[in-house]
C-alpha cells in the first residue's frame, strides 16, 4: 500500500480468482483513543472499533472511503483505491490502446518545435468518475523539471456504438535550449483513477522524435504567363523554431485531382516555393518536415487550383 | 527519398554539401545496423545515449546561432578554445566564435573517425561477419574533415590486445551511430546557418 495523495491510498493486488488479497491496517488520524468506530462509504454498518482497523482487501467491494467516527462526529477518512496486477502486468482498463505508432501506445505526444513545449493526449470510453494527474521530467534517475498543466477533455467522438473521449495536457520543459542534443528522454507519467480503480501510464521520448511542425502558412498561387504552370509559394509556420536557417524545414508539394483515385504529382523541395502544373479542379497541398531529422510531416496546407 | 527533389544551390559555403552527405551516410548506416542487428538492442528506446565528445568538445555551444545566445538555457559552457584556421571560413567577417565552432566540429569528426576505425577492425574479426562500417560513411567523414582543413594532432587508432566481445562491440556500434547521427544533424544545421549568413 502507498499514499497517492493525502488520505488516498493505493492497494496493489495480484488479480486472479480466489486471490488472498492484501491485509491493510488503517489508522484513525486523531488523538482520541476510545469510542472510535469505522464505516465504509455511505453505509452505516460498523466494520470495527478502535484506533486501527485491519481489513483484507481482495476485490473492489473492499475498496472505498473508510471513515472513523466518534459519537457521530467524523474524525478522519482514508480512501482506498485498487491497482490490479494481472499475471505480472499492471492493468490498462481505463485508457484505449491507440496502436500508433505501435501496439500498447496509450499516451501520444507531439511538439510543434524544439522549445521544450509538447502536448500529450489519450483516449478513453469512460465518461464519468474519472480523474487524471500528469507529471513529467527529463530523465528519471536525476530528473530535471518539466511543468505540466491540468489534463482537460479536448474532444468527443462517436465510434460505432461507443463514445470516445480524448484528454490532453500541455507540458513545458523548465529550461530548454532548442539547439541542445538530447541524451536523456522526457518521461511523462499519467495517474488515472476511475471510481475505485487506479492505473498509471508512462511514455518516454526525445522531443526530436515527436516533432510535428504546423502546416506551412500563407500558401499562395501565382500563374505563370502563357503556361499551365503556377508558382506555389508559402512560409514557415509561426510556431516553428527560429532561426529558420538553423532549424530548416523541407517541403512536399502535391497536386491532387478531385478524385482520390487520380495520380498525385509530388515534388520535394527545401525552398519556400515551387513550380507545378495546375490541373482543372485540382488542389495544391504543401506539408513540412524537419529537414535534417525525419520525424513527422505536418498536416497539409491546401489551396484550390482555380 | 526516391521522388524528385529540387536541390538547393550549394552556395558559397564549401562545407554544406559535405555535411549533407555526412548526414545521409550516417542515417543509412544506422538504418542498416538496426535491420542487420534486429536481435540486438539497437533502437533509440533501447540504447544508452552516450556522447563520446562530452567534455572534450562543445560543438552545440560553440556553434550556437546568435539568435539563441539570449537563451540562458543554451549558455551552459562556452569556454572551450580551439585552433582557429580553416578553409571553410569563406569570409573574413567570420567571427572568432565561428572559428571555434568549425574547429569543434573537426575535433568531433576526428574522434568519431578513430572510434569507427577501431570498431571496424574488431568487426572484421567477427566469424559471423554480420556487419561492417560503410566505407562511404568513413570516406564522407574524411572529406568533411579535409574541407574543414584544420591542423590538428593525429589521434592514434586504438589497438586492443584482448579478444573482442563481438556482442558488446555491436551494441557499442549502435550507441555510436545514434550519437553520431544526432551530431551530424547539429553539424548540418550549423552549416546551413553559416551558409545563410
Amino acid at each position: 500500500i502507498w499514499e497517492l495523495k493525502k488520505d488516498v491510498y493505493v492497494v496493489e493486488l495480484d488479480w486472479y480468482p480466489d486471490a488472498p488479497g492484501e491485509m491493510v491496517v488503517l489508522t484513525c488520524d486523531t488523538p482520541e483513543e476510545d469510542g472510535i468506530t469505522w464505516t465504509l462509504d455511505q453505509s452505516s454498518e460498523v466494520l470495527g472499533s478502535g484506533k486501527t482497523l485491519t481489513i483484507q482487501v481482495k476485490e473492489f467491494g473492499d475498496a472505498g472511503q473508510y471513515t472513523c467516527h466518534k459519537g457521530g462526529e467524523v474524525l478522519s477518512h482514508s480512501l482506498l483505491l485498487l491497482h490490479k496486477k494481472e499475471d505480472g502486468i499492471w492493468s490498462t482498463d481505463i485508457l484505449k490502446d491507440q496502436k500508433e505508432p505501435k501496439n500498447k501506445t496509450f499516451l501520444r505526444c507531439e511538439a510543434k518545435n524544439y522549445s521544450g513545449r509538447f502536448t500529450c493526449w489519450w483516449l478513453t470510453t469512460i465518461s464519468t468518475d474519472l480523474t487524471f494527474s500528469v507529471k513529467s521530467s527529463r530523465g528519471s534517475s536525476d530528473p530535471q523539471g518539466v511543468t505540466c498543466g491540468a489534463a482537460t477533455l479536448s474532444a468527443e467522438r462517436v465510434r460505432g456504438d461507443n463514445k470516445e473521449y480524448e484528454y490532453s495536457v500541455e507540458c513545458q520543459e523548465d529550461s530548454a535550449c532548442p539547439a541542445a542534443e538530447e541524451s536523456l528522454p522526457i518521461e511523462v507519467m499519467v495517474d488515472a483513477v476511475h471510481k475505485l480503480k487506479y492505473e498509471n501510464y508512462t511514455s518516454s521520448f526525445f522531443i526530436r522524435d515527436i516533432i510535428k511542425p504546423d502546416p506551412p502558412k500563407n500558401l499562395q498561387l501565382k500563374p505563370l504567363k502563357n503556361s499551365r504552370q503556377v508558382e506555389v509559394s508559402w512560409e514557415y509556420p509561426d510556431t516553428w523554431s527560429t532561426p529558420h536557417s538553423y532549424f530548416s524545414l523541407t517541403f512536399c508539394v502535391q497536386v491532387q485531382g478531385k478524385s482520390k483515385r487520380e495520380k498525385k504529382d509530388r515534388v520535394f523541395t527545401d525552398k519556400t516555393s515551387a513550380t507545378v502544373i495546375c490541373r482543372k479542379n485540382a488542389s495544391i497541398s504543401v506539408r513540412a518536415q524537419d529537414r535534417y531529422y525525419s520525424s513527422s510531416w505536418s498536416e497539409w496546407a491546401s489551396v484550390p487550383c482555380s | 527519398r526516391n521522388l524528385p527533389v529540387a536541390t538547393p544551390d550549394p552556395g558559397m559555403f564549401p562545407c554544406l554539401h559535405h555535411s549533407q552527405n555526412l548526414l545521409r551516410a550516417v542515417s543509412n548506416m544506422l538504418q542498416k545496423a538496426r535491420q542487420t542487428l534486429e536481435f540486438y538492442p539497437c533502437t533509440s528506446e533501447e540504447i544508452d545515449h552516450e556522447d563520446i565528445t562530452k567534455d572534450k568538445t562543445s560543438t552545440v555551444e560553440a556553434c550556437l546561432p546568435l539568435e539563441l545566445t539570449k537563451n540562458e538555457s543554451c549558455l551552459n559552457s562556452r569556454e572551450t578554445s580551439f585552433i582557429t584556421n580553416g578553409s571553410c571560413l569563406a569570409s573574413r567577417k567570420t567571427s572568432f566564435m565561428m572559428a571555434l565552432c568549425l574547429s569543434s566540429i573537426y575535433e568531433d569528426l576526428k574522434m568519431y573517425q578513430v572510434e569507427f576505425k577501431t570498431m571496424n577492425a574488431k568487426l572484421l574479426m567477427d566469424p559471423k561477419r554480420q556487419i561492417f562500417l560503410d566505407q562511404n560513411m568513413l570516406a564522407v567523414i574524411d572529406e568533411l574533415m579535409q574541407a574543414l582543413n584544420f591542423n590538428s594532432e593525429t589521434v592514434p587508432q586504438k589497438s586492443s590486445l584482448e579478444e573482442p566481445d563481438f556482442y558488446k562491440t555491436k551494441i557499442k556500434l549502435c550507441i555510436l551511430l545514434h550519437a553520431f547521427r544526432i551530431r551530424a544533424v547539429t553539424i548540418d544545421r550549423v552549416m546551413s546557418y553559416l551558409n545563410a549568413s
Partner: antibody, heavy 115, light 111 residues
C-alpha cells in the same frame, strides 16, 4: 472453490459452425479476463482468444481472426467461443482459462472437424 | 509460429536433476514474467511456476524456475517417476499482450 465447466464440443463438418461454453463458479466471474486455449492432437498449446472482464476488448490469434468470436455473459457467469467456417486444422481440445498469475483451467472439450 | 523455443525432450533417472530451457526474445521473456505448466496425458495443464520463480501452494519444492535476460529455465531436482509429462513455458509479448505465448513444449522422460 473456482470451477470452470466446459460444454459444446463434438464432431462437425468443414465449413460448419459450433459454439463452446464455459460455465464459471466459485468466484466473481465479472471481475476477470478469460482465455480460450487449444491443443491439436499430439501438438503443443496454442492461444486462441482473450476477452476483458467487462467484454469491452477482445483479442484473437491470427489463425482464427474473422472466424471465431469470443463473448461472455456476466449475468450467467458464462464464457463462449463461437466458431464459424471450421477447418480440419481447428481440430483440437479447447480449454477455457482464467487470466492471472494463478490460473484455473476448464476440463477441456474436444472439437473434431471432419467430413 | 512459436516464439518461445524449448528442447523437444529431456530425460533423467530418478533422483537426478533435470532442466528445461525456454528461449525467447527482448520483447517477450526479456520484459515479461514466465510461467511453467505441467501436462499429464489427457488432462488440462497444471501451473507449476508463475512470476519466473514463484511456486503456487501445493507444488513440490523440487520444481524451481529462473529467468535470465531473454531465457528462462525450469529445474526438477530429484526427478520422480510421476514427473514424466509434457512441460510448457508461457510468457507475453509487449506488442501482442494479452495473447499468451507458449513454448514448443518438452517431453520429460524418467528412465
Amino acid at each position: 472453490q473456482v470451477q470452470l465447466v466446459q460444454s459444446g464440443g463434438g464432431v462437425v463438418q468443414p465449413g460448419r459452425s459450433l459454439r463452446l461454453s464455459c460455465a464459471a463458479s466459485g468466484f466473481t466471474f465479472s471481475s476477470y479476463g478469460m482465455h480460450w486455449v487449444r491443443q491439436a492432437p499430439g501438438k503443443g498449446l496454442e492461444w486462441v482468444a482473450f476477452i476483458r472482464y467487462d467484454g469491452s476488448n477482445k483479442y484473437y490469434a491470427d489463425s482464427v481472426k474473422g472466424r471465431f468470436t469470443i463473448s461472455r455473459d456476466n449475468s450467467k457467469n458464462t464464457l463462449y467461443l463461437q466458431m464459424k467456417s471450421l477447418r480440419a486444422e481447428d481440430t483440437a481440445v479447447y480449454y477455457c482459462k482464467t487470466h492471472g498469475s494463478h490460473d484455473n483451467w476448464g476440463q477441456g472439450t474436444m472439437v473434431t472437424v471432419s467430413s | 509460429s512459436y516464439v518461445l523455443t524449448q528442447p523437444p525432450s529431456v530425460s533423467g533417472t530418478p533422483g537426478q536433476r533435470v532442466t528445461i530451457s525456454c528461449s525467447g526474445g527482448r520483447s517477450n521473456i526479456g520484459r515479461n514474467t514466465v510461467k511453467w505448466y505441467q501436462q499429464l496425458p489427457g488432462t488440462a495443464p497444471k501451473l507449476l511456476i508463475y512470476g519466473n520463480d514463484q511456486r503456487p501452494s501445493g507444488v513440490p519444492d523440487r520444481f524451481s524456475g529462473s529467468k535470465s535476460g531473454t531465457s528462462a529455465s525450469l529445474a526438477i531436482t530429484g526427478v520422480q517417476a510421476e514427473d514424466e509429462a509434457d512441460y510448457y513455458c508461457q510468457s507475453y509479448d509487449r506488442g501482442t499482450h494479452p495473447a499468451l505465448l507458449f513454448g514448443t513444449g518438452t517431453k520429460v522422460t524418467v528412465l
